[in-house]
């Protein structure tokens, strides 16, 4: 019998009282087969967190800070359920830290230093701990002890607290520092009063502090938000302009064995029975004998944190980068201008050779980071162990929804101003055999499907688009008799024409042989009775342009396009029957690398792109015999985006919108992860 | 963004023509699909014709518009066209112009469609 109990820790007395209701009442409520509580007692949230992973106990609630030593080794814990607020149509899970300005002030972030600042307190998360943190590298040193690196950064500040007999430039703005209400310039409503009193330049607080303190929009329309990429923005698009995103109180479990569905079982049972006005006897989110016991008082109920999720995705890039800074205290040498080397996310074995091979070319410019698949290399990216990648239009958008942007586009056709001029498209074609000849768009159900992969556009968005358009359910493996459609689940039908073996079978990478454009033309030579590919893929692998032995007798001739009217068409008449005209790949990255990115990616091309003639000789980096590594084959030159800078832009408005409503038949759990960060 | 605006329709006899255009701004690159949809009183709207901007290719959704009805465009101006020749008063409705940037011709569903038109009213009299 699975033990079903979960062993909660509380760090005070109070805490183990309630926790002992807590576990009294769930048992009157729930059957005896079902989620149970036993309380374990700490000195700490640090004892709580390494009991956890001795698996002395199994759950603990922490706020952002807790959250972080939490994930670090040797504890390895991950967020499992979050506590929310607000209401249940708009939870409110993240709350956003922000820097205020008044509008006329007319510097950016990176102007900071030799203005003065208002804090909501020394140590806290808003007002103190992540813009210190984001800052940190550009403090005088030496930054220890931190608070007089602070205090000669800016020219004053009131950092309530904070000791202003030894750093009186921290009080200056709040004589004597008072470290509660008594301070008119203490916590978030202090700190922006600080701001609005014109005592300082900029506020460090939370998002919603200036809507709580201004409640006329005319009011609010004199403040600015500071943007770590040098703009300003209104104060309501504090979702774009912030410095990190933090989560409110989140319950930790251990990543293996960490029984986190029981977690969520138990609290989700106990959230519809003793949450927010349920029961007079027991509730869950109120202390009589304290303050924010085991939970926040103010919390409304709880979410289940998606599993694709560790701490460093659900804390955000910056919120780490914030607190990794003020931990370790590590800055490179000296700051400078020079771009550091461009960290590369390679999928697998293949693109690792290739990425290698453009490294040690690049003279250091380019590094290599593994991933096994596309997710997880925007995962990489979005933590920083990576830097960017070339995607297609599928994974562009689920990057995007992760809050990484498009810099540069991939270009397939030959023009005189290639690196200007990014294209409308690529076309999204259905391919069969000529002999099949009875095969329509309309008679596709019960056939053999070959598809790039899951996610992607050509090969999966666009026809599953149009496919669940018809037959509004997302039962794909039911409509096709079988297929290789690779990232999708192992025991699926839409798995089973595939060719890796063992464990790289329906792989979404090269491993597995009937991945991408080539391997699902492949799929469809060997075995299935349509291919969901580029109009570019089938002329790419017939008349002996493919070399290998499956390619290399195929003619181009006896393939045809399904075109969405009915009819079918030679090949090369792709403009005239295509499903879709699809966005090229594009490079993705963090908004922090954007402008590093660009400048080393436009030499890289003009020294390794499309102008080297001798491929056999040299590094190439649009070349890999068909198997599009790290690029397409068939790219030209990488094009300026101009305006189309954000995934919502650059893939375009239908496009978004086809890919959201194939969102009700997502398996990415990547994306369900960014969603729970940015609904 | 892309804005599309129709003009033409009006009132006429059965047997009698009428020509609707269809003037679309604001795209750049690549060729698109642009169709003509009607909606009869009390109906959901039906697709009738469809053009491949970047190719000149045309679409009938059937054979009763075919012969009567024809769909061309002038890319100089932008603009998309529908004869409709030999009206019956069963081709009254309101007539919508659309065009996706993303799907091919050929699909007559309206959700893919993108962009959509005010509409011109079409009334055919016996």
């Known amino acids: 019998v699975p033990d079903k109990t979960v062993r909660w820790c509380a760090v005070s007395e109070h805490e183990a009282t309630k926790c002992q209701s807590f576990r009294d009442h769930m048992k009157s409520v729930i059957p005896s087969d079902g989620p149970s509580v036993a309380c374990v007692k700490k000195a700490s949230y640090l004892d709580c967190i390494r009991a956890i992973a001795a698996n002395e106990a199994d759950a603990v609630t922490l706020d952002a800070g807790l959250v972080y030593d939490a994930y670090l080794a040797p504890n390895n814990l991950k967020p499992v359920v979050a506590e929310f607020y607000g209401s249940k149509e708009d939870p409110q899970t993240f709350y956003y830290a922000v820097a205020v300005v008044k509008k006329d002030s007319g510097f950016q972030m990176n102007q900071l230093r030799g203005k003065k600042s208002c804090h909501t307190g020394l140590g806290r998360s808003a007002g103190w701990n992540i813009p210190i943190g984001l800052l940190y590298c550009d403090l005088p040193e030496p930054r220890k002890p931190l608070e007089k690196a602070v205090a000669n950064f800016f020219s004053g500040s009131c950092a309530p607290c904070a000791d202003g007999t030894d750093f009186p430039q921290l009080c200056q703005l709040c004589p004597g520092c008072g470290c509660s209400t008594l301070n008119q310039y203490f916590g978030y409503s202090g700190a922006f009063k600080c701001l609005k009193d014109g005592a300082g330049d900029v506020a460090f607080v939370k998002h919603s502090t200036i809507f709580e303190n201004l409640a006329n929009k005319a009011d609010r329309d004199q403040y600015e938000l500071l943007c770590l990429d040098n703009t300003r923005k209104p104060v309501d698009e504090y979702k774009d302009c912030h410095l990190a995103q933090v989560p409110s109180h989140t319950v930790v479990a251990r990543s293996m064995g960490g029984k986190e569905d029981l977690i969520w079982e138990l609290l989700n049972q106990a959230q519809e029975h003793f949450g927010k006005d349920k029961s007079k006897e027991f509730q869950l989110f109120s202390s009589p004998h304290g303050k924010d016991l085991l939970f926040k008082d103010s919390a409304h109920g709880f979410l289940k944190v998606p599993p694709r999720m560790d701490a460093k995705m659900y804390l955000g890039y910056e919120y780490v980068t914030a607190i990794r800074n003020l931990r370790e205290g590590t800055c490179p040498e000296a700051p400078t201008d020079e771009c550091k080397p461009v960290k590369w996310c390679a999928l697998s074995h293949h693109e690792r050779l290739k990425c290698d091979e453009w490294s040690v070319n690049s003279v250091g410019k380019i590094e290599c980071v593994s991933a096994e698949t596309t997710e997880d290399c925007i995962a990489k990216i979005m933590n920083g162990e990576a830097d960017a990648m070339s995607l297609d239009g599928g994974f562009v958008y689920i990057a995007g929804k992760c809050g990484l942007v498009p810099v540069l586009a991939e270009n397939y056709n030959k023009s005189d101003n290639c690196e200007d001029t990014p294209e409308a498209g690529y076309f999204a074609i259905a391919v069969v055999k000529k002999s099949a000849s009875d095969l329509t768009w309309d008679n596709l159900k019960g056939k053999k499907s070959c598809h790039t992969a899951v996610g992607r556009t050509a090969g999966w968005n666009i026809p599953m688009g149009l496919l669940y358009n018809k037959i509004n359910h997302c039962r794909f493996d039911e409509f096709f008799s079988e297929g290789c459609a690779p990232g999708s689940k192992k025991d699926s039908s839409l798995c089973k024409l595939c060719m890796g073996s063992g464990l790289n079978l329906c792989e979404p990478n090269n491993k597995e042989g009937y991945y991408g454009y080539t391997g699902a033309f492949r799929c469809l030579v060997e075995k299935g009775d349509v291919a969901f590919v580029k109009h570019q893929t089938v002329p790419q692998n017939t008349g002996g342009k493919n070399p290998d032995p499956w390619a290399k007798n195929l003619n181009e001739k006896d393939y045809e396009l399904l075109c969405l009217d009915g009819t079918r068409k030679p090949v090369e008449e792709y403009a005239n029957c295509h499903l879709a005209r699809a966005p090229n790949h594009a490079v993705v990255t963090r908004k922090d690398k954007e402008a590093c990115v660009h400048k080393i990616l436009r030499q890289q091309q003009h020294l390794f792109g499309s102008n080297v003639t001798d491929c056999s000789g040299n590094f190439c980096l649009f070349r890999s015999e068909t198997k599009d590594l790290l690029f397409r084959d068939d790219t030209v030159c990488l094009a300026k985006l101009h305006d189309r800078n954000t995934y919502e832009k650059y893939l375009g408005e239908e496009y978004v919108k086809a890919v959201g409503n194939l969102r009700k038949c997502s398996t990415s759990s990547l994306l369900e992860a960014c969603t729970f960060r940015r609904p | 963004d892309v804005q599309l605006v129709e003009s033409g329709g009006g009132s006429v006899q059965a047997g009698g023509s009428l020509r609707l255009s269809c003037q679309a701004s604001g795209y750049t690159g690549g060729g698109h699909c642009m169709a003509w949809f009607r909606q009869a009183p009390g109906k959901d709207r039906e697709g009738i014709a469809a053009?491949?901007?970047?190719?000149?290719?045309?679409?009938y959704a059937d054979e009763s518009v075919k012969g009567r009805f024809i769909i061309s465009q002038d890319n100089a101006r932008s603009t998309v066209y529908l004869q409709m020749d030999s009206l019956k008063p069963e081709d009254t409705g309101m007539y919508y112009c659309?065009?996706?940037?993303?799907?091919?011709?050929?699909?007559?569903?309206?959700?893919?469609?993108?962009?959509w038109g005010q509409g011109t009213q079409v009334t055919v009299s016996s």
């Open positions: 053009i491949y901007t970047g190719t000149g290719s045309t679409y």
């Open positions: 659309a065009a996706t940037l993303l799907y091919g011709c050929g699909a007559w569903s309206p959700r893919l469609f993108g962009y």
